[in-house]
């Protein structure tokens, strides 16, 4: 009778095992082991027992002990079961961003591992088991479908293999795949709201605001604002599920014409875009031209107004005849025209909007000097010792210099409060002088003496 010990062994792949072959007779003619595995007999005394070290066991094997005794030949098999953990445990690649509400298929592939009867594949979200199945096929594949929820954001999905050899007196061997971190998102179907000027003048700045509600996670949203080829650099402020991106846009003469303003919101692997057209225009203020800005009284003056070729102008409220970009008026300069404003208003239609520009010029009329009764009375009668202020206003442009002298030396204190004395009485020659000439006027001061009772 041949026996073998152990009759059943589970060992790691590539491992070694000692197998004892025994026979019941004392002097066997033959005692050995038949195996394709590398073997080495241990040096042990005695004839009826032999021990072999079987090494580099790569797969399940059934070495057979045999003995030849006087009463016949017999054999006994031992069953070597090799265990090894899978060489590959992998989740099939998926885009890291997944929209909320989508069905996501997780696929785990497992290569290798034995014994397969003890190998289980587990799909997990964090530590929560989603599916558990025995490993079948090579490679073994286990799939499950997950409905993506908002609260899955940042969750780690993984695949774990469990080689459970506890029933064989060994341990539970676990292998885990690299985790797949799910990023969930909500990008509403509504495009972003874009608020911007429809028209924008060259060499000015405008403000563009792009906003969108109902985003998740809002902090991960990317906002791209552009005017034509010019990328704008917005300042983004975030709400709970909304953002507002504000940017300043500057335009130059090169941008003139119709430009596309775009606001694109990118979240996950989706995007929403809003397009708007902005008309960039150049509209300098109209030009008011006076023949001369400073003329003498009585001079003929031409006032011209010139604007953008497509503009329509009015000069001092009077539309150009015919209606167009030019208007003019003629006048003979009078003192009343001094400081008169000539206002030109130009209107240009840009993309259905009326743009107004004004330009004003002032005419200076040189006249005078003038001394008249109204502003410089020729006769004053004042009681002696009373407080009086002599008034005499000379007119003209430029404003004349005024002096009133009695006997060529004694001045009348114009505009000053004085106590009337006998000395003040007399006739004064008031002289108003400017670059335009001079005029004189006699002013008499009478002093009334008080009556003595």
């Amino acid at each position: 009778q041949t026996s073998v010990s152990p009759s059943k062994v589970i060992l790691p792949r590539g491992g070694s095992v000692l197998v004892t072959c025994s026979t019941s007779c004392d002097q066997p003619k033959l005692l050995g082991i038949e195996t394709p595995l590398p073997k080495k007999e241990l040096l042990l005394p005695g004839n009826n027992r032999k021990v072999y070290e079987l090494s580099n066991v790569q797969e399940d094997s059934q070495p057979m002990c045999y003995s030849n005794c006087p009463d016949g030949q017999s054999t006994a098999k031992t069953f070597l079961t090799v265990y090894w953990t899978p060489e590959r445990v992998e989740l099939a690649p998926l885009p890291s961003w997944q929209p909320v509400g989508k069905n996501l298929t997780l696929r785990c592939q497992v290569e290798g591992g034995a014994p397969r009867a003890n190998l289980t594949v587990v799909l997990l979200r964090g530590e929560k088991e989603l599916k558990r199945e025995p490993a079948v096929g090579e490679p073994a594949e286990v799939t499950t479908t997950v409905l993506v929820r908002r609260d899955h954001h940042g969750a780690n999905f993984s695949c774990r293999t469990e080689l459970d050899l506890r029933p064989q007196g060994l341990e539970l061997f676990e292998n885990t795949s690299a985790p797949y971190q799910l990023q969930t998102f909500v990008l509403p179907a509504t495009p972003p709201q874009l608020v911007s000027p429809r028209v924008l003048e060259v060499d000015t700045q405008g403000t563009v605001v792009c906003s969108l509600d109902g985003l998740f996670p809002v902090s991960e949203a990317q906002v791209h604002l552009a005017l034509g080829d010019q990328r704008l650099n917005p300042t983004v402020t975030y709400g709970n599920d909304s953002f507002s991106a504000k940017a300043s846009v500057s335009v130059t003469a090169e941008d003139e014409g119709t430009q596309r303003l775009t606001c694109a919101v990118i979240l996950g692997n989706q995007s929403q875009e809003t397009l708007q057209t902005v008309t960039i225009y150049s509209f300098p203020a109209p030009n008011v031209i006076l023949t001369k800005p400073e003329v003498s009284e009585g001079t003929e003056v031409t006032v011209k107004c010139e604007a953008h070729p497509r503009a329509k102008v009015t000069l001092n409220g009077v539309p150009a005849q015919p209606l167009g970009p030019r208007a003019q008026l003629l006048l003979k300069a009078t003192p009343e025209d001094n400081g008169r404003s000539f206002s030109c208003s130009a209107t240009l239609e840009v993309a259905g909007q009326l743009i107004h520009k004004n330009q004003t010029r002032e005419l200076r009329v040189l006249y005078g000097p003038r001394l008249d009764e109204r502003d410089c009375p020729g006769n004053w009668t004042w009681p002696e010792n009373s407080q009086q202020t002599p008034m005499c206003q000379a007119w003209g442009n430029p404003l004349p210099e005024l002096k009133c002298l009695k006997d060529g030396t004694f001045p009348l204190p114009i505009g000053e409060s004085v106590t009337v004395t006998r000395d003040l009485e007399g006739t004064y020659l008031c002289r108003a002088r400017s670059t335009q000439g001079e005029v004189t006027r006699k002013v008499t001061v009478n002093v009334l003496s008080p009556r003595y009772e």
């Epitope: 000692l18 040096l43 042990l44 005394p45 027992r49 021990v51």
Partner: antibody, heavy 117, light 110 residues
């Protein structure tokens, strides 16, 4: 760390008996073949006795056959050598050693047995 | 009288190389059984030095090497050091005796 610790040595008269013990630790004793090897003062090493891991087979050197008995208690991780009818030529340091299957890979520190009247 | 024969002594100076021989017969070394070597430092238990003719257990310096040819084997120690001063024993198995054999030992003096 494999450790083998012998005890039980001492002075005994010729014809007397002594029981040596070897406490094993740091390995699975119940899977190990064990042996006793001795060394007479100033002499070389001599194999004495051998026992299978399960105690089922025992072998002895001709010089001690019939007088010495090797045994083991796997529950206590202990190897024994019962020495009867001791002679002066049995005086030696007795080592317990673990047998790998081809060589003695670990040895105890030894215990001295002196047989003298 | 040991069945495996070793020279009783050997000596060398530090840095030298020494060789210790072990001669057996056709029932042990000559029968293909492996030779193993043990080092016994003064006052201590033997320690496995070389196994299966020429393999070193971990922790044994590569200054120690073994070889086997026919019915004999040898242990070589190169770059001799003072701490190598010890007794060295060869060991094999004898099929006719069904017993483990040790050589008589060689005392190495450095």
């Amino acid at each position: 760390e494999v450790q083998l610790l012998e005890s039980g040595g001492g002075l005994v008269q010729p014809g007397g008996s002594l029981r040596l013990s070897c406490a094993a630790s740091g390995f699975t004793f119940s899977n190990a073949w064990m042996s006793w090897v001795r060394q007479a003062p100033g002499k070389g090493l001599e194999w004495v006795a051998f026992i299978w891991y399960d105690g089922s087979n025992k072998y002895y050197a001709d010089s001690v056959k019939g007088r010495f008995t090797i045994s083991r208690d796997n529950s206590k991780n202990t190897l024994y050598l019962q020495m009867n009818s001791l002679r002066a030529e049995d005086t030696a340091v007795y080592y317990c050693a673990r047998y790998s299957g081809w060589y003695f890979d670990y040895w105890g520190q030894g215990t001295l047995v002196t047989v003298s009247s | 009288q040991s069945v495996l024969t070793q020279p009783p002594s050997a000596s060398g100076t530090p840095g030298q190389r020494v060789t210790i021989s072990c001669t057996g017969s056709s029932s042990n070394i000559g029968a293909g059984y492996d030779v193993h070597w043990y080092q016994q430092l003064p006052g201590t238990a033997p320690k496995l030095l070389i196994y299966d003719n020429n393999n070193r257990p971990s922790g044994v310096p590569d200054r120690f090497s073994g070889s086997k040819s026919g019915t004999s084997a040898s242990l070589a120690i190169s770059g001799l050091r003072s701490e190598d001063e010890a007794d060295y024993y060869c060991q094999s198995y004898d099929s006719s005796l069904s017993a483990w054999l040790f050589g008589g030992g060689t005392k190495l003096t450095v």
